[in-house]
């Protein structure tokens, strides 16, 4: 097909982060076209010569795909017709980080948008009471982080208190020699209090909470990706 009129179509991307070793999504949407055969999606990465992925005439066209993405990419083919050009990236690598371009051609015109993709490792922390310790102690563990994060303890009762003097954090390299296990121990814990173990790097921030009372222990944890914006 040809583009007969000079029109720009709106393409929207969202900055995101990938967890190395897992699958990731590079988000991209565009003004849909009525015919799937008239839609071309090209994903490019700055610094890479070949294409990350190309979808045209209703199917993948991978003859110009760069070697580093071979067998690792897919679009959501059934959602292209409604304007979803997002890319699934399998087995995210540290080297996948960088600037990507989602480039769209339809019968209405062309458009493109860039997105920053960060890669690293992040995982949910789990906080437990360490019964083996001589004093009341909490142990915060998270299996996979990269780059090396910071760990900060906080408590509901002693808000604003600095626990760096009564805590100890260690980082243990995992078997694949990239990610690390995070272990942080907090000493001199008092009962009837809620403690938070906050782990953060430039990609993600995760918090593990533990509420310790005479009768029960309650745990909660959550993780948020940082700097994800349109």
């Amino acid at each position: 097909f040809g583009i007969s009129g000079r029109h720009s179509i709106t393409v929207t991307t969202v900055a995101s982060a990938g967890n190395i070793g897992e699958d990731g999504i590079l988000s991209c949407t565009f003004e849909p076209d009525i015919k799937l055969s008239d839609i071309v999606i090209q994903w490019l990465k700055e610094g890479v010569l070949g294409l990350v992925h190309e979808f045209k005439e209703g199917k993948d066209e991978l003859s110009e795909q760069d070697e580093m993405f071979r067998g690792r990419t897919a679009v959501f083919a059934d959602q292209v017709i409604v304007g979803n050009a997002s890319l699934r990236l399998k087995n995210v690598q540290l080297t996948d980080a960088g600037t990507y371009k989602c480039y769209i051609i339809t019968s209405k015109g062309k458009g493109n948008a860039n997105l920053e993709y960060k890669t690293g490792a992040f995982s949910m922390p789990e906080v437990n009471v360490d019964y083996n310790a001589s004093s009341e102690t909490l142990r915060c563990e998270a299996p996979r982080w990269f780059p090396q994060p910071t760990v900060v303890w906080a408590s509901q009762v002693d808000q604003g208190a600095n626990f760096s003097e009564v805590s100890n954090t260690s980082f243990e390299l995992n078997s694949e020699n990239v990610t690390m296990k995070v272990v942080s121990v907090l000493y001199n814990v008092t009962i009837n209090n809620t403690y938070s173990c906050m782990i953060e790097n430039d990609i993600a921030k995760a918090t593990g909470d533990i509420k310790v009372t005479e009768s029960e222990i309650k745990r909660r944890s959550h993780l948020q990706l940082l700097n994800s914006k349109a």
């Epitope: 097909f1 040809g2 583009i3 007969s4 000079r6 071309v40 490019l44 700055e46 610094g47 890479v48 010569l49 070949g50 110009e64 760069d66 070697e67 580093m68 080297t95 960088g98 600037t99 371009k101 480039y103 051609i105 062309k110 493109n112």
Partner: antibody, heavy 117, light 105 residues
Framework: EVQLVESGGGVVQPGRSLRLSCAAS????????MNWVRQAPGKGLEWVSA????????YYADSVKGRFTISRDNSKNTLYLQMNSLRAEDTAVYYC??????????WGQGTTVTVSS | SYELTQPPSVSVAPGKTARITCGGN??????VHWYQQKPGQAPVLVVY???DRPSGIPERFSGSNSGNTATLTISRVEAGDEADYYC????????FGTGTKLTVL
Amino acid sequence: EVQLVESGGGVVQPGRSLRLSCAASGFTFTSRAMNWVRQAPGKGLEWVSAISGSGATAYYADSVKGRFTISRDNSKNTLYLQMNSLRAEDTAVYYCARKRWYGMDVWGQGTTVTVSS
Amino acid sequence: SYELTQPPSVSVAPGKTARITCGGNNIGSKSVHWYQQKPGQAPVLVVYDDSDRPSGIPERFSGSNSGNTATLTISRVEAGDEADYYCQVWDRGMIFGTGTKLTVL
């Protein structure tokens, strides 16, 4: 300030070799693909070769395939073009240029290669 | 291989509008870039992605691309715009147009 400075040009006999260098500064060299483009006297621009940011992938124009090799040393922020089996038709000003998506956004001032007996 | 055709020369009076064309099969589906080259100097990017301008390039430079023709338009032409102009696309390598010499009368 982003800068590309080529060097290594000169006069060389047909069949001989020459290596061009391009020193880059002012940007993260590893994150950008790079190109060599040449211009014969009084002629238009001709793309020669491109290399990915990591140096893992390279493309060549048919006219130089098998004779020229593009490479880069990311620790030195330097791009190279090794030119073997030079011919008279390789006489040109050689520019290094930073690739930006489907185009080139920064060019060096060029270095002159003359192949003559 | 993909070919781009430009007129060898375009002449225009100062203050008028110059249009330089670049022809290629279904070029409208490609991303076109334009370079200005003055004698003895390196090329300079003046328009990228069909119609976008790098910082520092005057608004007088604009581009369009549809069908089989891309066009570089220079409005209110000045003497300093006299140069060679090249269009370019990527097709598993950089493909340059044949070049157009812009003469300001």
